[in-house]
């Protein structure tokens, strides 16, 4: 492999924790217009496994607002609007990266963290366990 | 928002772009009890709007591999296994943060980027447009 020369154009880091503590530019690329998932689609209402979106706010985290899906029913909604309990509404989860202020309240010091969020719900056939 | 007091124990930043460039501890903290709980469900197969997972790979990004859900059908799967085209399988999308080296090959400088990924699929009632 190529030995990468220390580039004079790179930010310098003499931090004793290097390489674990680095500079991160938060001037985000691909900043989308909407951050509220309700604005981007109404699937949460039209799904056979509808969900509500709950605002999870934490000023010590970036992004400070994350929307968490909670399935409205245990079962799935049929064409007639009734709930079919032979099927299950389940949350689809995704692991995401966030930044958490560390130490707390320090405006420019963060730690990378992985958290699990529920993005929406889907309707699944239940697993039936047969008792011998 | 709250005015965060300048804590004397915080790393100092006189960067003119502050708070766009921050110090981040990259020793990733996983808030979940198991290594990766999202990996253990088979909803993608059991859903009435099943999906396949496609690999999106980029060696210059962390995480290097992201899985993209692609709905298997236009319609939704009925109890008898046939597809009902009066309903629609649609992808549920989520905006996630990834890290990219910037400038490239600088060991201690990163940029945060937002990307939109499809996490799974859900079954929705179609929007019917009536022609006057």
């Amino acid at each position: 492999g190529i030995a990468i020369p220390r580039n004079s154009g790179c930010p310098n880091s003499e931090d004793k924790n290097f390489p674990r503590t680095v500079m991160v530019n938060l001037n985000i690329h691909n900043r989308n217009t909407s951050t509220n998932p309700k604005r981007s689609s109404d699937y949460y209402n039209r799904s056979t496994s509808p969900w509500n979106l709950h605002r999870n706010e934490d000023p010590e985290r970036y992004p400070s607002v994350i929307w968490e899906a909670k399935c409205r029913h245990l079962g799935c909604v049929k064409a007639d609007g009734n709930v079919d309990y032979h099927m299950n509404s389940v949350p689809i989860q995704q692991e995401i990266l966030v930044l958490r202020r560390e130490p707390r309240h320090c405006p420019n010091s963060f730690r990378l963290e992985k958290i699990l969020v529920s993005v929406g719900c889907t309707c699944v056939t239940p697993i039936v366990h047969h008792v011998a | 928002g709250i005015a965060i007091p300048r804590n004397s124990g915080c790393p100092n930043s006189e960067d003119k772009n502050f708070p766009r460039t921050v110090m981040v501890n990259l020793n990733i903290h996983n808030r979940n009890t198991s290594t990766n709980p999202k990996r253990s469900s088979d909803y993608y197969n059991r859903s009435t709007s099943p999906w396949n997972l496609h690999r999106n790979e980029d060696p210059e990004r962390y995480p290097s591999v992201i899985w993209e859900a692609k709905c298997r059908h236009l319609g939704c799967v009925k109890a008898d296994g046939n597809v009902d085209y009066h309903m629609n399988s649609v992808p549920i999308q989520q905006e996630i943060l990834v890290l990219r080296r910037e400038p490239r090959h600088c060991p201690n400088s990163f940029r945060l980027e937002k990307i939109l990924v499809s996490v799974g699929c859900t079954c929705v009632t179609p929007i019917v447009h009536h022609v006057a």
């Epitope: - | 990259l26 253990s40 060696p59």
Partner: antibody
């Protein structure tokens, strides 16, 4: 094309340590993890731990916790695995592998470590 | 740890045969299962990732299926170069491998 080239075979005494290197040629480490997997003679594969060289973050298998140290030097695109307090059961071929955190898609050629008095 | 159990531990087959190897996980792992081929004195080689996706450069006679706890690797028409040991591996949690299946010439 990524190639992982490992250091040569080692013979060690019980109680000593061994440090095996793994150099990525044909590119940098990129954002992948590097995992270490060992295989005792005639046996199966056993994951020992991993490092994300970009971050220096390590993750070790419970069995090797406290005895294994994985490090990486990005300037030379080299990862290292050091195993201490060696015993005869540690005689094995040690492999490094590029790890996407979902699968191991590129492997080193392996380094035979023999522990014998 | 998640235990992976392969069967059979060895099998004898002829060139042209259809070969099936199974792998069972001690708990549900969704589709986070990979298959590797290892020849004597060589490093393992990734064949199938995420239960059913063929790694680039791997012949299409190899295929994988399954989800949850039960998985299968199939070689549709065994070729001389396919005689080797095959391992399954889960990555739902810290990685663990099956004990291996040796495919020998009949």
């Amino acid at each position: 094309q990524v190639q992982l080239v490992q250091s040569g075979a080692e013979v060690k005494k019980p109680g000593s340590s061994v440090k095996v290197s793994c150099k990525a040629s044909g590119g940098t480490f990129s954002s992948y993890a590097i995992s270490w997997v060992r295989q005792a003679p005639g046996q199966g594969l056993e994951w020992m731990g991993s490092i994300i060289p970009w971050f220096g973050t390590t993750n070790y298998a419970q069995k090797f916790q406290g005895r294994v140290t994985i490090t990486a030097d990005e300037s030379t695109s080299t990862a290292y695995m050091e195993l201490s307090s060696l015993r005869s059961e540690d005689t094995a071929v040690y492999y490094c592998a590029r790890d996407s955190e979902y699968y191991f898609d590129h492997w080193g050629q392996g380094t035979l470590v023999t522990v014998s008095s | 740890d998640i235990q992976m159990t392969q069967s059979p531990s060895s099998l004898s087959a002829s060139v042209g045969d259809r070969v099936t190897i199974t792998c069972r996980a001690s708990q549900g792992i969704s589709n986070w299962l990979n298959w590797y081929q290892q020849k004597p004195g060589k490093a393992p080689k990734l064949l199938i990732y995420a239960a059913s996706s063929l790694q680039s450069g791997v012949p299409s006679r190899f295929s994988g299926s399954g989800s949850g706890t039960d998985f299968t690797l199939t070689i549709s028409s065994l070729q001389p170069e396919d005689f080797a040991v095959y391992y399954c591996q889960q990555y739902s949690d810290d990685p663990t491998f099956g004990q291996g299946t040796k495919v020998e010439i009949k």
